[in-house]
Structures are given as structure tokens and as C-alpha cells.
Amino acid sequence: QQQTLPKPFIWAEPHFMVPKEKQVTICCQGNYGAVEYQLHFEGSLFAVDRPKPPERINKVQFYIPDMNSRMAGQYSCIYRVGELWSEPSNLLDLVVTEMYDTPTLSVHPGPEVISGEKVTFYCRLDTATSMFLLLKEGRSSHVQRGYGKVQAEFPLGPVTTAHRGTYRCFGSYNNHAWSFPSEPVKLLVTGDIENTSLAPEDPTFPADTWGTYLLTTETGLQKDHALWDHTAQNLLR
């Protein structure tokens, strides 16, 4: 006999990266007929919702009107049908951005290079931080993590035209509190590629990470729950 129900999906709308003082909705999708949903924050009960009528609802929303560092962290949810509880969802890492300062992003040898040249991004932030994140805009979003006292290096290695695009970086004060985004740096890669072994090795997510970050909740954009959960896990771990 089944002792638990399947775990629900958890995600954030419009995004798990939330600018300070902006609103965010944490969504939990379980099964029709669930009489209670619980949202847990850092391992403790945070909020409860009892959908009405339960047989017509399989998703609940927990609204945070004013994001701040105290609300940033790891969330999970569970639901109950009758007396039977579900497995907990995967962890959702909710990040507050636009904290404190703005890093500076630069690229060496320059913003325009020839395919095959080695390229390194530098993200610098003079305030107390040791972790930095480099994000590439576009449908195929690349995320890299780097460390340093005031500056982190992000070596891309020999670049191809696939590395073309606009990059931004964040300083991270902890796993869930990030700085303002840097000004964008546009990397242009010219030249035909003869060596196909130069394909980029960055992790790729099939969604527009930065574009979604810029969206507001008014768009009501629905994201693929599993994808965003997966993105958050990769980015923050």
C-alpha cells in the first residue's frame, strides 16, 4: 500500500531571482483533491493553503509582496489528500538581487575576438563578497560560478561563434543574496571555424534566464516547473 503521494512541483513566478522589494509568487502544484498544501522555508513551516474546492484545484500560490534577504533561501512544499501526505518537492532556491552594490564586468583581450582565441571574463565587486556568477543572455543560457576576494575570473577558453552574446555578472553575498547585475558586456566573435572541437562546454539551459529575470509578475508568464527547478539547482549548487 502506498504510504506517500508523489512529490509536487515547486517554482517561482516570474523567476527565482527576485529584485529586492519586488513581488514574487511561489507556486506549488500537486494533485486534484489535495485538501492542504504546506510551504516550508529553510526546513520550517512557512505557510499553509487549503484550496476550495480541492477537487477542482491542483495548484496553489504563495505570494510574497516585498522581497528581502530574510525571505531568500530554500523553499519546499508538500500536500495532503485525506490523511496521506506527499513526498516533499525539490528545493526551490529563492534569490534576492539588487543588494548593496553593482559589480563591474570586463572581458580580455577585448569585446571583439577571433574564433579560437582564449577569452576571460572578470567580474569585480569591492564590497565583501567571494562568490560571483556570470550569466549569458539568450535562449541557451550559460551560467558560471567563480570565486575571489574582490574579483573572479571566468575563463571561457578558445571561443567559437556560439559564445557570441551579452553577458552580465552578479556578486553573491551568500547563496541567496546577490548584488545588482553588472552593466552588460557584448562579446563579438568573428571568423570562420575550421576546428569543430572548439564547441563550448558551459552548462546549457533551454530558456532565457536573463530575459525572464527582467520580466515582471504582470506578464503572468507560466514557466516549465521542472525546468526552473532544475535551473535553480544547477545555478546555486
Epitope: 583581450p109 574564433s115 578558445p158 571568423g191
Partner: antibody
Framework: EVQLQQSGPELVKPGTSVKISCKTS????????MHWVKQSHGKSLEWFGG????????SYNQKFKGKATLTVDKSSSTAYMELRSLTSEDSAVYYC???????????WGQGTTLTVSS | DIVLTQSPATLSVTPGNSVSLSCRAS??????LHWFQQKSHESPRLLIK???QSISGIPSRFSGSGSGSDFTLSINSVEPEDVGVYYC?????????FGPGTKLELK
């Protein structure tokens, strides 16, 4: 020690072609792009173009469109620039220069003097 | 194309004095500006990278400053061997361009 050794001076006739070489040593040839810079007598420096030995990718200054072809021979760690349809305007000193990925042109060849005259 | 303008065209200086050479870009190039020295009958030599970063082996009397479109190369206490032409170079975008140069000579 990093060295860029260029081929000797050339005296050629108008309308012909010439191929200048730049033999490198002291570093991994494929890790740095190689660029070519023109300096007419008593004038400033003009970037002709660059090539990445790693990929064969090239970038040319459109001002000199069709004038040059950049190639490399990885087996001998040598870069080449072929100049065609030469005129007296092409008479100059041509430098090869390595572009460091953490700065700019950090090592230069000694220059090759090209004289185009009938 | 990014056009670099250098001033003055010629600079006459007494050894031991300090000088400043100017380079102005036709558009903002952040700090992607490099300085070269070329002595007579020699190849150019990289002096300063990224507007203000020093190069190993270059005397400390050479320093750079500026960002955006206005840049300065300073030589603190000029030595006789500093005679030559000084070029700034745009490292921001292709085509990579050089300024027309500033000729440094001794009085």
C-alpha cells in the same frame, strides 16, 4: 624566450604577389592569435588583420579588403601573410604581432620591408 | 571604426621633467586602450595595457590613466632613452586602430 622571426626584405614589381612569413618560437603557437600591422614610411600603424592558429578563424580590416590572405602552418609554428595586386601604396614595413589574451600585442616581429617598384 | 586622436603631435622635453600624452577615442571604449612605444628603427613595444595596467619589464616611470574616451600616458622624470613615438591603440573592437602617434624628443 618568445621570438617572432620575419622573412627578409622584398623588392617586387607592381601587379605581383608576395608572401611574408613570421616564424615563432618560445611559446605554444596555437594559444595566441597572430596579427599583422602595416607601417608606411614615417606614418602610424595600421592593423591589417589577425588569425587564430587554433581554429583558422580570421578577421580582416575592411580598409584592405581583398589585399591580404592570412594563413598558418601549425607544424612549423609559422604565420603567413600573402599580399596581392601590389602597388606602390603597399610599400611599407609589415610587422607580425602576437595578441596576448590578457593584454594586446605583447611580442612583435622585427618587421619585413616591402618595396613595390617597377 | 574607432578613431584615436593623439596630442600633441610632438613634445620636446628636458630630461628629468615629467610629461603627459593625450589620446582621445571617437567613442567610448571603456578601458580597452593600450600604449606602445616605438624607437627609431625598432618594432613597437607594449608599455601599458587596459589604460592603466603596468607591463612586466617596463620602467615604473610610465603610467596610464583614463577610461571611456579620454586617456593619458604619463612619463615621470623623462630619461634620454624615452625618445621615440608613442601610440595608443583601441583594443575594444575590430578593426583594431592606432592613434597617429606623439613624437617625444629632447630639448
Amino acid at each position: 624566450e618568445v621570438q617572432l622571426q620575419q622573412s627578409g626584405p622584398e623588392l617586387v614589381k607592381p601587379g605581383t604577389s608576395v608572401k611574408i612569413s613570421c616564424k615563432t618560437s618560445g611559446y605554444t603557437f596555437t594559444e595566441y592569435s597572430m596579427h599583422w600591422v602595416k607601417q608606411s614610411h614615417g606614418k602610424s600603424l595600421e592593423w591589417f588583420g589577425g588569425i587564430s592558429p587554433n581554429s583558422g578563424g580570421t578577421s580582416y580590416n575592411q580598409k584592405f579588403k581583398g589585399k591580404a590572405t592570412l594563413t598558418v602552418d601549425k607544424s612549423s609554428s609559422t604565420a603567413y601573410m600573402e599580399l596581392r595586386s601590389l602597388t606602390s601604396e603597399d610599400s611599407a614595413v609589415y610587422y607580425c604581432a602576437r595578441r596576448d589574451f590578457h593584454s594586446s600585442f605583447d611580442y612583435w616581429g622585427q618587421g619585413t620591408t616591402l618595396t613595390v617598384s617597377s | 571604426d574607432i578613431v584615436l586622436t593623439q596630442s600633441p603631435a610632438t613634445l620636446s622635453v628636458t630630461p628629468g621633467n615629467s610629461v603627459s600624452l593625450s589620446c582621445r577615442a571617437s567613442q567610448s571604449i571603456s578601458d580597452y586602450l593600450h600604449w606602445f612605444q616605438q624607437k627609431s628603427h625598432e618594432s613597437p613595444r607594449l608599455l601599458i595595457k587596459y589604460a592603466s595596467q603596468s607591463i612586466s619589464g617596463i620602467p615604473s616611470r610610465f603610467s596610464g590613466s583614463g577610461s571611456g574616451s579620454d586617456f593619458t600616458l604619463s612619463i615621470n622624470s623623462v630619461e634620454p632613452e624615452d625618445v621615440g613615438v608613442y601610440y595608443c591603440q583601441n583594443g575594444h573592437s575590430f578593426p583594431l586602430t592606432f592613434g597617429p602617434g606623439t613624437k617625444l624628443e629632447l630639448k
